[in-house]
């Protein structure tokens, strides 16, 4: 769509184009399957424009339909990863708070591969916190070209 000159002068946040691209900070301790993310220009090619981080989890600040994307590469990977473990080795992205909106948005399995990646369009609301849960004995790479997570506001 064409923007007026006045709109062109506005910061992206005021246009509703919230966007974030994050890199892995660390995994959780025992019994905590969450991945903890970080973002900012000092860290390299990661940033937050609108959304914010709350203890390593991504919080949405504007209602809308978002493209959510994630890629995770394992630093410790067995060529027989899935068959070696009794529990499924999966990555799930979901709304983890508020509890009333808790839902899984993406679920992926490491089927004898070392990298998984996916994306989807989904409605998100202000205050939604997205959690990325890695289930199983897995250690993801912190290389920023191998493991990343982001959202992009698409439309109201």
């Amino acid at each position: 769509q064409r923007l007026s000159r006045a709109q062109q002068q506005l910061p992206l946040e005021s246009l509703g184009w919230d966007i974030a691209e994050l890199q892995l900070n660390h995994t959780g301790p025992q019994q905590d399957p969450r991945l903890y993310w970080q973002g900012g220009p000092a860290l390299g090619r990661s940033f937050l424009r609108g959304p914010e981080l709350d203890k390593g989890q991504l919080r949405i600040r504007r209602d809308g339909i978002y493209m959510v994307h994630i890629q995770v590469t394992l630093a410790i990977c067995s060529s027989t990863s899935t068959s070696r473990h009794h529990h499924p080795t999966t990555l799930a992205v979901g709304i983890c708070s508020p509890a009333s909106r808790s839902i899984s948005l993406l679920r992926l399995s490491f089927h004898q591969g070392c990298t998984i990646a996916s994306q989807r369009l989904t409605p998100l609301a202000r205050g939604d916190t997205l959690c990325t849960n890695l289930t199983g004995t897995l250690l993801p790479s912190r290389n920023t070209d191998e493991t990343f997570f982001g959202v992009q506001w698409v439309r109201p």
Partner: antibody
Framework: EVQLLESGGGLVQPGGSLRLSCAAS????????MSWVRQAPGKCLEWVSA????????FYAESVQGRFTISRDNSKNTLYLQVNSLRAEDTAVYYC?????????????WGQGTLVTVSS | EIVLTQSPGTLSLSPGERATLSCRAS???????LAWYQQKPGQAPRLLIY???SRATGIPDRFSGSGSGTDFTLTISRLEPEDFAVYYC?????????FGCGTKVEIK
Amino acid sequence: EVQLLESGGGLVQPGGSLRLSCAASGFTFSSYAMSWVRQAPGKCLEWVSAISGSGGSTFYAESVQGRFTISRDNSKNTLYLQVNSLRAEDTAVYYCARHDYSNYPYFDYWGQGTLVTVSS
Amino acid sequence: EIVLTQSPGTLSLSPGERATLSCRASQSVRGNYLAWYQQKPGQAPRLLIYGASSRATGIPDRFSGSGSGTDFTLTISRLEPEDFAVYYCQQYGYSPFTFGCGTKVEIK
């Protein structure tokens, strides 16, 4: 300066146990995955076990699975390896080693090692 | 598991000469995730090369790594007296992470 200092090795009888420790300093210990690697006298290096920075994930070589347990105490900047049901073939110098920051298990710093001798 | 075979077992050379060490994997190494280490008697290994060709911090540029897939090479362009040691390759693409059994570079 990054330093890793192993201790706890010694002479033990077959079937016995030891607890190896690795005291780390000079870096943010909890940010790094760690491994134990061993080297039998005059032999090749062998990766034994790894643990994530948070301690939430652990990994073992098949030869030690079920007998060895890796753990860490990030408040004490210390890595451990509990070694049980020891066999003669476990005789080796045991090194603790730091993974690269990426988490990949190539080892940018190593300790000087602690010798475990299993003999009756 | 991936078996790494290093050759030759021993390399006898003089200071100033070029050393070429080979490491061959029994199957393709994921992402060329291969490292080289130097070990001197009574000491711990020291990281030289990671990712098949990236020099570790503080490693002189006379050390270089190359190769991909199953065939990898460590080259020391001009041997210095302190370079005489045992060199190990290690693959970290797949668990279990395996090491070669080393090439000894000795003074001729």
